[in-house]
């Protein structure tokens, strides 16, 4: 159950409502837990998790990644630039999260929860951002053809792609969490 939707929150009216930052923090941690569960199934199913860093680096995917210029690291930290990067990155990850939807047997619901919780996180962050004009939304047509191409890959490539998406999304969220805690 995504944060803020469990019955314990409803049954505890004395508890202070979460601040916007706390809610975002809790949402990211919830998604990270979901990714861990998905990674567990992926690693149990194949030996992808032992793949060398070199092989993983040599891929045709264009997954969002934090760079120095994004202003999310301690050195050169820039709140507005960083927030734009986080939101843009999450929007770019959405097509890859859609790809994950048919990639799991026993964790199907978990994959859906990660996808839906990410949509909620984007909404939380958009409310926080002042400069929404700077956020570029991915082109739906480009996303549709990318999704088709990913789904057409051979079995080994699909497993590698799944593993890399989960690993990259985890790293992106961890960097985002650290940066948001500085805001």
């Amino acid at each position: 159950v995504p944060p803020g939707e469990d019955s314990k929150d409803v049954a505890a009216p004395h508890r202070q409502p979460l601040t916007s930052s706390e809610r975002i923090d809790k949402q990211i941690r919830y998604i990270l837990d979901g990714i861990s569960a998905l990674r567990k199934e992926t690693c149990n199913k194949s030996n992808m998790c032992e793949s060398s860093k070199e092989a993983l680096a040599e891929n045709n995917l264009n997954l969002p990644k934090m760079a120095e210029k994004d202003g999310c690291f301690q050195s050169g930290f820039n709140e507005e630039t960083c927030l734009v990067k986080i939101i843009t990155g999450l929007l770019e990850f959405e097509v890859y999260l859609e790809y994950l939807q048919n990639r799991f047997e026993s964790s199907e619901e978990q994959a859906r929860a990660v996808q839906m919780s990410t949509k909620v996180l984007i909404q939380f962050l958009q409310k926080k951002a002042k400069n929404l004009d700077a956020i570029t939304t991915p082109d739906p047509t480009t996303n549709a053809s990318l999704l088709t191409k990913l789904q057409a890959q051979n079995q080994w490539l699909q497993d590698m792609t799944t593993h890399l998406i989960l690993r990259s999304f985890k790293e992106f969220l961890q960097s985002s969490l650290r940066a948001l805690r500085q805001m």
Epitope: S52, E54, E58, N102, Q153, N154, Q155, L157, M160
Partner: antibody, heavy 120, light 111 residues
Framework: EVQLVESGGGLVQPKGTLRLSCAAS????????MNWVRQAPGKSLEWVAR??????????YYADSVSDRVTISREDSQSMLYLQMTNLKTEDTAMYYC???????????WGQGTSVTVSS | EIVLTQSPPSLAVSLGQRATISCRAS??????????MNWFQQKSGQPPKLLIY???NQGSGVPARFSGRGSGTDFSLIIHPVEEDDTAMYFC?????????FGGGTKLEIK
């Protein structure tokens, strides 16, 4: 020993229907994606259709040239692969091969083929 | 779809010499450190037989005379030394993504 034996080919009139079968043995059929590939007389090879495994939701894929006229299916309990072909055209005349696909997308084992002739 | 252009369409090589067949892909068939290019031999009246998989690995029971090389978009099948029994059609095939595609074929003749 891996064996793939096709059947069901023959002479059929244009707009006719045919169902090809492939009996697989010598491997765990349910863990492999399977394909149909055809070869017109004196021509190159042309991939027709593919079905993946249960763990991949039995997804199916088709060549654009046949997508609205053929259906690939599998019966894991019987180790059988099928290709249902409708509204056949003269250009569908070919040898049809049942082919196993490995984890890396390699078409590693081929049956002897079944011949399909579409003619009036 | 990934288009494979094979050359030459036919080739005549003297016994014991080297035969080289090329295959060019319209886009890279390489990802995560592997090139998904395969080579098949087809003798008259027979189904294709796998010779080389993932660019350079020999299929089961394939003689060492057959080797594959290349990466990305450009690949070649080398047969050396050529034997009488190698008279056949040779096809390249990409297994990176569906639709699986094949080259137009090369007819090898032994002089």
């Amino acid at each position: 020993e891996v064996q793939l034996v096709e059947s069901g080919g023959g002479l059929v009139q244009p707009k006719g229907t045919l169902r090809l079968s492939c009996a697989a043995s010598g491997f765990s059929f349910n863990t492999y994606a399977m394909n149909w590939v055809r070869q017109a007389p004196g021509k190159s090879l042309e991939w027709v259709a593919r079905t993946v495994t249960k763990s991949n939701k039995y997804a199916t894929y088709y060549a654009d040239s046949v997508s609205d006229r053929v259906t690939i299916s599998r019966e894991d309990s019987q180790s059988m692969l099928y290709l249902q072909m409708t509204n056949l055209k003269t250009e569908d005349t070919a040898m049809y091969y049942c082919v196993r696909e490995d984890y890396y997308g390699t078409l590693d084992y081929w049956g002897q083929g079944t011949s399909v002739t579409v003619s009036s | 779809e990934i288009v494979l252009t094979q050359s030459p369409p036919s080739l005549a090589v003297s016994l014991g010499q080297r035969a080289t067949i090329s295959c060019r892909a319209s886009e890279s068939v390489h990802n995560f450190g592997i090139s998904f290019m395969n080579w098949f031999q087809q003798k008259s009246g027979q189904p294709p037989k796998l010779l080389i998989y993932t660019a350079s690995n020999q299929g089961s029971g394939v003689p060492a005379r057959f080797s594959g090389r290349g990466s990305g978009t450009d690949f070649s099948l080398i047969i050396h030394p050529v034997e009488e029994d190698d008279t056949a059609m040779y096809f390249c095939h990409q297994g990176k993504e569906v639709p699986w595609t094949f080259g137009g074929g090369t007819k090898l003749e032994i002089k």
